[in-house]
């Protein structure tokens, strides 16, 4: 990546890290308005299985691991990217390394959910306060989950699917910050680990993933009012360990692994027409990216 100043543009889709043959340090940004990609400042350490989020206009890269020819190191790191300066800076690390982590943001606080350290599959969850640069453990999940999809809706944190070390999961649970407790919600129709999970129009979407046998292209959404999961149109590509985000009322899925190939494909879901379309390609195929969108 380049170290020059990034153009000051609004609402880009950032993709950080990932895996192709080894963990990657790329940071790239896609501009849906003109279809262009920007090559930005590399992560200071390559990582895959990380998560991305945006707080206060800053992009955070959370957890993951560095799988390289020199070895394999799970990451407890939290790093912050400033789009205005095109620079990364380290923040306080989490209490434990978390590969294949999920993250969500409530009231400007980052929640780091699950993930693995070696063969330990975490059910622990911790919250980061950017103003204090501090992490604090909160109530653990009811289930150990890596490859967990995390989304926030109505100030509640949802953890969806994943792998507990033995089984891939269709279960999901919800965290209530005021009570500091987790409760199970309706299970998905499909077992999904490494799915893309996001919120759009008051529904939680779970796209793709791996059911313990195959990569999936199916997509389902959870209606919090009816507490039911319903299938929507499938993606064009089967994919697990994909990146996902929402931009201007549409869902974007990036990359992933289809069981044979590391995908460069980026698909976009339009809820009005219930259709997926190929919108662009990443500069190279990869799985396990961290994805987030900058605010206006």
């Amino acid at each position: 990546g380049s170290m020059g100043h990034a153009p000051k543009v609004g609402r880009l889709i950032y993709t950080a890290g990932g895996y192709f043959r080894q963990s990657l340090s790329y940071l790239e940004a896609y501009n849906p308005s003109d279809g262009t990609w920007l090559d930005l400042a590399d992560l200071q350490v390559p990582r895959s299985g990380l998560a991305g989020c945006v707080v206060g206009g800053l992009l955070y890269a959370v957890g993951g691991r560095n799988n390289s020819p020199d070895g394999n190191t799970d990451s407890s790191a939290l790093d912050c990217y400033n789009p205005m300066t095109n620079q990364w800076s380290p923040c306080a690390p989490m209490s434990v390394p978390r590969n294949r982590i999920g993250v969500g943001v409530i009231d400007g606080h980052i929640y780091a959910v699950g993930g693995s350290h070696g063969c330990i599959h975490h059910n622990s969850v911790e919250r980061y306060e950017p103003e204090r640069d501090e992490w604090h453990l909160v109530a653990p999940m009811l289930t150990r989950r890596i490859g967990v999809g995390v989304a926030v809706l109505n100030r509640l944190l949802y953890a969806v699917g994943g792998f507990d070390g033995t089984n891939r999961l269709n279960s999901a649970e919800c965290y209530y910050p005021e009570r500091n407790e987790w409760r199970m919600i309706t299970a998905m129709n499909t077992i999904r680990s490494g799915a893309g999970v996001c919120v759009l129009h008051n529904c939680i979407y779970a796209a793709g993933g791996y059911d313990g046998q195959d990569q999936l292209n199916s997509v389902e959404r959870y209606d919090v009012e009816t507490e039911t999961w319903t299938f929507v149109a499938p993606m064009k590509h089967r994919r697990s360990a994909l990146g996902i985000t929402v931009h201007q009322g549409r869902i974007y899925v990036l990359g992933g692994y289809d069981g044979h190939t590391f995908l460069d494909s980026v698909e976009c879901y339009d809820p009005d027409t219930d259709t997926w379309s190929e919108v662009t390609r990443m500069t190279s195929g990869r799985s396990g990216v961290g994805v987030a969108v900058t605010m206006e």
């Epitope: 895996y19 043959r21 895959s48 299985g49 799988n67 070895g71 394999n72 294949r100 070696g118 063969c119 330990i120 490859g147 792998f163 070390g165 033995t166 680990s193 490494g194 791996y210 313990g212 046998q213 195959d214 697990s240 360990a241 692994y257 069981g259 590391f262 799985s287 396990g288």
Partner: antibody, heavy 122, light 107 residues
Amino acid sequence: EVQLVESGGGLVQPGGSLRLSCAASGFAISASSIHWVRQAPGKGLEWVASIDPETGETLYAKSVAGRFTISADTSKNTAYLQMNSLRAEDTAVYYCVRRAAAKDWGVAAAYWGQGTLVTVSS
Amino acid sequence: DIQMTQSPSSLSASVGDRVTITCRASQSVSSAVAWYQQKPGKAPKLLIYSASSLYSGVPSRFSGSRSGTDFTLTISSLQPEDFATYYCQQSYSFPSTFGQGTKVEIK
């Protein structure tokens, strides 16, 4: 019944290449991580490489990193170990391994192939 | 890398004897330890996983235990078919590593 059958071993000169195959039956290789473990003549066991079916990520022992490549072809239900730049110290029986389906921590290797012998010598 | 130091490297015992083999990890590996039995010319067979769980089909005379970073495989009453080499393995952290083996021979 779960079965793993390795093939492709043989005699090769230092610097040469071989591709080992591991044909699986009784389960889909897409359903479990696959590992290669080797055993030099009269010696102990050494983990070599693995591939994760969910993320596609591969892991290698430092002794083989950059020279060996693990892969899988789900349509053939077969895993492979491509071995390049072979050295005398790579001489070993190579086993293809699948972890236990039972709850365990890490890689308790429940299913082993019969092994295939790789000899690197001039 | 985590070292698994196995002892003894060999032992002689008689049928009916109680046999104990120990593995010491160079750092914490929690309970992520497995034990294998290998006979000459054959692939290893899983006996114990998660330090103390008996794998399906393995006779109950085999057992495993953990005390901190010390792991023990016990054969309560040695049978003729138990003469073999035994290996421990940690899979707590990358890379997975094995002990150097213990050969159990007939006295």
